[in-house]
Interface confidence: low
């Protein structure tokens, strides 16, 4: 029951729904990423904070990363339930005192997102949405530029290699 050499309990990272997702999809996805645990046997379930009901969720395969494992689970919540606190409950034999690890997902303020655009209060939400879209655009633009750079580098390298080969052949003759 005790791991002497290292802490191999699941290490959680949480991902909250984006404003864009909640605005466009009328729902939000909570994602719970669990890393660096051993052994691979792990149980994950989701509940609302003040309820014992287990909610329907999905999970990825348990993946080996070096000497430990990782897994992720996600819960899609309808817009009406986004204002409730949710819990990702993780059961693993190396949770340090053997008790279930409870990862709290804070409520999402959907009222800020769904306000009338004419309302001044919604300006921040719209700005945030715009910022998110801008960031996403910037991200893809960056990837595109990176891809172009790789292609240019490949072409130049190829040209240089051919030129070198040509020069060398010239010297030999």
């Amino acid at each position: 029951d005790k791991q002497l050499d290292a802490d191999v309990s699941p290490k959680p990272t949480i991902f909250l729904p984006s404003i864009a997702e909640t605005k466009l999809q009328k729902a939000g996805t909570y994602l719970c990423l669990l890393e660096k645990f051993f052994p691979d046997v792990i149980k994950i379930h989701w509940q609302e904070k003040k309820s014992n009901t287990i909610l329907g969720s999905q999970e990825g395969n348990t993946m080996k990363t070096n000497d430990t494992y990782m897994k992720f689970s996600w819960l899609t919540v309808p817009e009406k339930s986004l204002d409730k606190e949710h819990r990702c409950i993780v059961r693993h034999e190396n949770n340090k005192n053997g008790v279930d690890q409870e990862i709290i997902f804070p409520p999402i303020k959907t009222d800020v997102i769904t306000m009338d655009p004419k309302d001044n209060c919604s300006k921040d939400a719209n700005d945030t949405l715009l910022l998110q879209l801008t960031n996403t655009s910037a991200y893809y633009m960056y990837l595109l530029l990176l891809l172009k750079s790789v292609v240019y580098f490949a072409i130049i390298t190829c040209c240089l290699l051919r030129r070198t080969a040509f020069c060398c052949n010239g010297e030999k003759s």
């Epitope: 005790k2 802490d7 014992n52 340090k96 005192n97 053997g98 008790v99 690890q101 409870e102």
Partner: antibody
């Protein structure tokens, strides 16, 4: 406020068995480990074992494996500990206690049940 | 099993004094240590968990510190209600053993 209510004192004869109970006041009974702790008169605390009422999973301190049996009734929100083949060294106060947090200790304790073997 | 050694076994102090109780683990337990107070005939009460986090409702004159194998519980400005027995307990794996206890008495 969560409360753990334990059964009353027991006076038992050597060689007999006793079953003590611990009822919890809140709905999360199934989702928390219920622990049992022994305290002999004027002595320190010893962890006996724990049960996860949700699926009946149990873990025991090696020293108590042959002595204690932990069970739980989810519908009654009650945990039980049966002590077998009692001798004078089993005379003690037995506490139930609940682990509430991943990084914490025993947050809630029962008031204790005195078992006297005589 | 991990052994928890608590010292001193008993301690006399006056109201208003500051006292420190120490606890040593036989191996590295990181921060997985709790402190409890127990009054005569009562059940233990959680004071500190995860080495230095005060449990709900515990006065700020109590503080926990330490990491790995060496831990301490400090009580500033002792109050009459603080007298009783104190126990440390590790919860790094099983079994979660307790220290032998420290009896804090009024001088």
């Amino acid at each position: 406020q969560v409360q753990l209510q334990q059964s009353g004192p027991e006076l038992v004869k050597p060689g007999a068995s006793v079953k003590i109970s611990c009822k919890i006041s809140d709905y999360t009974f199934s989702n928390s480990w219920m622990n049992w702790v022994k305290q002999r008169p004027g002595q320190g605390l010893e962890w006996i074992g724990r049960i996860y009422p949700g699926d009946g999973d149990t873990k025991y301190n090696g020293e108590f494996k042959a002595k204690a049996t932990l069970t739980a009734d989810k519908s009654a929100r009650t945990a039980y500990m049966q002590l077998n083949n009692l001798t004078s060294v089993d005379s003690a106060v037995y506490f139930c206690a609940r682990w509430e947090r991943y990084d914490g200790g025993f947050t809630y304790w029962g008031q204790g049940t005195l078992v006297t073997v005589s | 099993d991990i052994q928890m050694t608590q010292s001193p076994a008993s301690l006399s102090a006056s109201v208003g004094e500051t006292v420190t109780i120490t606890c040593r683990a036989s191996e590295n337990i990181y921060s997985y240590l709790s402190w409890y107070q127990q009054k005569q005939g009562k059940s233990p009460q959680l004071l500190v968990y995860y080495a230095n986090t005060l449990a709900e409702g515990v006065p700020s004159r109590f503080s926990g510190s330490g990491y790995g194998t060496q831990f301490s519980l400090k009580i500033n400005s002792l109050q009459p209600v603080d007298f009783g027995n104190y126990y440390c307990q590790h919860h790094y794996g099983l079994p979660p053993t307790f220290g032998g206890g420290t009896k804090l008495e009024i001088k």
